[in-house]
Structures are given as structure tokens and as C-alpha cells.
């Protein structure tokens, strides 16, 4: 029977900069029941606080609701593991909520085959940013990535769209049914999950771009 091993806070995520959750990985339990507590302070403060919510994020997590979430202030947090034989502490983790946003996927992905008379045909797609993200304030710059593939293909073709919410693709295989998805990330955050796939049938007379 031993004191617990050193835990590690390995992940923090926020859906929208208004709330966030951090997760830790326990160290060895030393063969005894072990209690974990997360304490934190905000930079510039000395007062330590305990995690306000150990439930919402699931096991080994701490959730910070709206009233506990401040942007532009670094949180300094650590996890304490305690059993009957002693304690161990994680390294301190410095967290700025602005940098840990993982948005929901973009919405309303629509895909169309455009066949202008005077130019080569192309696949045109557009989408909307996720609703929880407020782009009007200027706090967010969202970047987008598109991927597509013929229905039966194994490999995806990926295109970086930058900040645009629409995109054109010229080189496609005629007669194929394509799956198209889009995802987004803040400039210093994490990629969302891919949006649900949208299917598009490419006409057999679609002229391949040279």
C-alpha cells in the first residue's frame, strides 16, 4: 500500500468561451481508495478555489459553469490525489479559456453541381457557423476545412477554406456519388467534429477540369 501516483490534467475544452471542462488522468492508486480534488486560482489572485462541479463532465473532471468562467484571465489549476498513505499533486496547468474552444460542427451544409454555360462545371458548397459561436463580437475567427470522397472510396480529399463559408471544387469524377463534410476551428482552438455527411450525385456528363 502506497500513496497515490501523480495525476495529470491532460485536456480542457470549451464549446463557446462561456463554460469549460478539464479532465485529469489518475496516477496509480497505491492499492487504496483515492480521493481527487481540483483547486485553482486566477492569475493575479492568491485565493485558491475548489472545483465548482465534479459531475457534469463525467469521471475525473471539473466543469466550470458560466459564473466561474472568465475570458482573458489565466487559470492556474492542479489536482490533488489523496489516500490513507499520503498525497500527490499534478503539475500546475495554466489555462486561458480563449485558447481551448472546440466548437460544434458547422451547420446547414448545402452542396450543388453548377454547370455554367460559359465555364467548366464545378461543385459549390456553403455552410453556416455553429450557433453557439458569436462571430459578431470579433472574439472568434473561425477557420473551415472541407473533405469529400466518392461514396465507395477509402481516402478523403481535404481542402482548407480559410474563413470562407463557401467553396468551389472543380475536379470531380463524373457519375459518382460524393460524400461532403465540413468542420471548423477557432484560430487558436480545436477542430470541431465533422458535420453530418451531405451526399451529391455528380452527373455523368460533368466535364473534368484539366
Amino acid at each position: 500500500q502506497l500513496p497515490p501516483g501523480k495525476p495529470e490534467i491532460f485536456k480542457c475544452r470549451s464549446p463557446n468561451k462561456e463554460t469549460f471542462t478539464c479532465w485529469w488522468r489518475p496516477g496509480t492508486d497505491g492499492g487504496l481508495p483515492t480521493n481527487y480534488s481540483l483547486t485553482y486560482h486566477r492569475e493575479g489572485e492568491t485565493l485558491m478555489h475548489e472545483c465548482p462541479d465534479y459531475i457534469t463532465g463525467g469521471p475525473n473532471s471539473c466543469h466550470f459553469g458560466k459564473q466561474y468562467t472568465s475570458m482573458w484571465r489565466t487559470y492556474v489549476m492542479m489536482v490533488n490525489a489523496t489516500n490513507q498513505m499520503g498525497s500527490s499533486f499534478s503539475d500546475e496547468l495554466y489555462v486561458d479559456v480563449t485558447y481551448i474552444v472546440q466548437p460544434d460542427p458547422p451547420l446547414e451544409l448545402t452542396v450543388e453541381v453548377k454547370q455554367p454555360e460559359d465555364r467548366k462545371p464545378y461543385l459549390w458548397m456553403k455552410w453556416s457557423p455553429p450557433t453557439l459561436i458569436d462571430l459578431k463580437t470579433g472574439w472568434f475567427t473561425l477557420l473551415y476545412e472541407i473533405r469529400l470522397k466518392p461514396e465507395k472510396a477509402a481516402e478523403w480529399e481535404t481542402h482548407f477554406a480559410g474563413q470562407q463559408t463557401e467553396f468551389k471544387i472543380l475536379s470531380l469524377h463524373p457519375g459518382q456519388k460524393y460524400l461532403v463534410q465540413v468542420r471548423c476551428k477557432p484560430d487558436h482552438g480545436y477542430w470541431s467534429a465533422w458535420s453530418p455527411a451531405t451526399f451529391i450525385q455528380i452527373p455523368s456528363d460533368f466535364i473534368m477540369n484539366d
Epitope: F10, C12, G44, V95, T98, Y99
Partner: antibody, heavy 120, light 107 residues
Framework: EVQLVQSGAEVKKPGSSVKVSCKAS????????MHWVRQAPGQGLEWIGE????????NYNQKFKDRATLTVDKSTSTAYMELSSLRSEDTAVYYC?????????????WGQGTLVTVSS | DIQMTQSPSSVSASVGDRVTITCKAS??????VAWYQQKPGKSPKLLIY???NRYTGVPSRFSDSGSGTDFTLTISSLQPEDFATYFC?????????FGGGTKVEIK
């Protein structure tokens, strides 16, 4: 204990490429951005670029955009910096440096440095 | 790019002295400034982040004041282990840039 261990010194010819490695241990590699910084002999520090090991998304100093390539191998917790079209003024100690937290770009852990000498 | 101008480039001081190093940003950087200490042949070591927050384990004799464009690193009572070169760094906008360094030497 957090450690960043870099590959050994290199001597390269002008026009060639060099690839420096940085093996991370003591923490979850995908949690923190990794940066690359260089220091010419007797000079100051110059930031080359940064990479997020969780998804390999990277940002570069425009000065190095066309010549530097940052990559990671998650399976071995190793970051790499490749610099191509080397010239004599690229002679420097190259450091990998881990982001201080989940936030802005200040650097709490540094590798021991790799001296790259470019000479004909 | 934001230029970070450090002064002086070197300073001679004795153990127990108060030493101040200044760093001037060419444009507004808020409090997005860090300070590092580097000894010969060694990697830099973080001292201060966000202009005024001491990193874990850094002695209280190191402090920073300033925001916007003007920053000052103060060593309140110089110790033998503090003889080194000090760099400021801004992380307000890409590319992240460093000052040219200030060497603190023994008088």
C-alpha cells in the same frame, strides 16, 4: 518530470536540408503546442513556428514559411523541424519549446538545443 | 512584425544590487509579454508571463511592471545565480518576437 530531448549537432552544406527532432516525455504530448526557436551564435532568439500535436495544425513566422516544415509523430511523442535550402546565416542553435499551458505562447520547457552549422 | 527593444544591452552590478531592465514594444501588446533568463550554453528559462505573473518556482525578487508598450523587469536584490542574459518576448501578434537581450555581469 517534463523533458524535451533534442537530436545531436549537425553540419550541413549550403543548399541542403536539416531535420531536428525533439522527443517529449513526462506529459501528454498532444496537450500542448510545441514551438521552435533559434539562436544564432552570440545573438538573440528568433521564433520559427508552432505546431499543435493533437492535429498537426501549424503556424509559421513568414520569414521561414517557405523553408521550414514542422511535423509530429504522436506514436513516439516526437516533434520535428525541417529547414531546407540552408545558408550560412542559418547556423544557429535550434530549440524546441513547449507552450506554458493551454493558452498564449510563452514557453515553460525548452529542449537542450541542437547546433546546426552550415558550412561549405 | 512587432519589435521588442531591450535596454541596456548589458549592465554591471554587484550582489545585493537592484537591477532594472526595460523592454519597449514597437506597438501595443497589452500584457502579452514574458521574460526569460539564459545562462551561457544553456536553454532559456521562463521567469515571468503575462507581464507580471511569476512562473512556478521563480523567486519573488523577480518582478515585472508595465503594460501596453513599456515593460520593466526588476531584480530587487541580485544574487550570484542571477548573472545571466535576460530576454523579453511578446505573444500579442504573430510572429512572436524577442528582445535582443540584456547581459547582467558582475561588477
Amino acid at each position: 518530470e517534463v523533458q524535451l530531448v533534442q537530436s545531436g549537432a549537425e553540419v550541413k552544406k549550403p543548399g541542403s536540408s536539416v531535420k531536428v527532432s525533439c522527443k517529449a516525455s513526462g506529459y501528454t504530448f498532444t496537450t500542448y503546442w510545441m514551438h521552435w526557436v533559434r539562436q544564432a551564435p552570440g545573438q538573440g532568439l528568433e521564433w520559427i513556428g508552432e505546431i499543435d500535436p493533437s492535429d498537426s495544425y501549424s503556424n509559421y513566422n513568414q520569414k521561414f514559411k517557405d523553408r521550414a516544415t514542422l511535423t509530429v509523430d504522436k506514436s513516439t511523442s516526437t516533434a520535428y523541424m525541417e529547414l531546407s535550402s540552408l545558408r550560412s546565416e542559418d547556423t544557429a542553435v535550434y530549440y524546441c519549446a513547449r507552450n506554458g499551458g493551454l493558452g498564449p505562447a510563452w514557453f515553460s520547457y525548452w529542449g537542450q538545443g541542437t547546433l546546426v552549422t552550415v558550412s561549405s | 512584425d512587432i519589435q521588442m527593444t531591450q535596454s541596456p544591452s548589458s549592465v554591471s552590478a554587484s550582489v545585493g544590487d537592484r537591477v532594472t531592465i526595460t523592454c519597449k514594444a514597437s506597438q501595443y501588446v497589452g500584457t502579452a509579454v514574458a521574460w526569460y533568463q539564459q545562462k551561457p550554453g544553456k536553454s532559456p528559462k521562463l521567469l515571468i508571463y503575462s507581464a507580471s505573473n511569476r512562473y512556478t518556482g521563480v523567486p519573488s525578487r523577480f518582478s515585472d511592471s508595465g503594460s501596453g508598450t513599456d515593460f520593466t523587469l526588476t531584480i530587487s536584490s541580485l544574487q550570484p545565480e542571477d548573472f545571466a542574459t535576460y530576454f523579453c518576448q511578446q505573444y500579442s501578434s504573430y510572429p512572436w518576437t524577442f528582445g535582443g537581450g540584456t547581459k547582467v555581469e558582475i561588477k
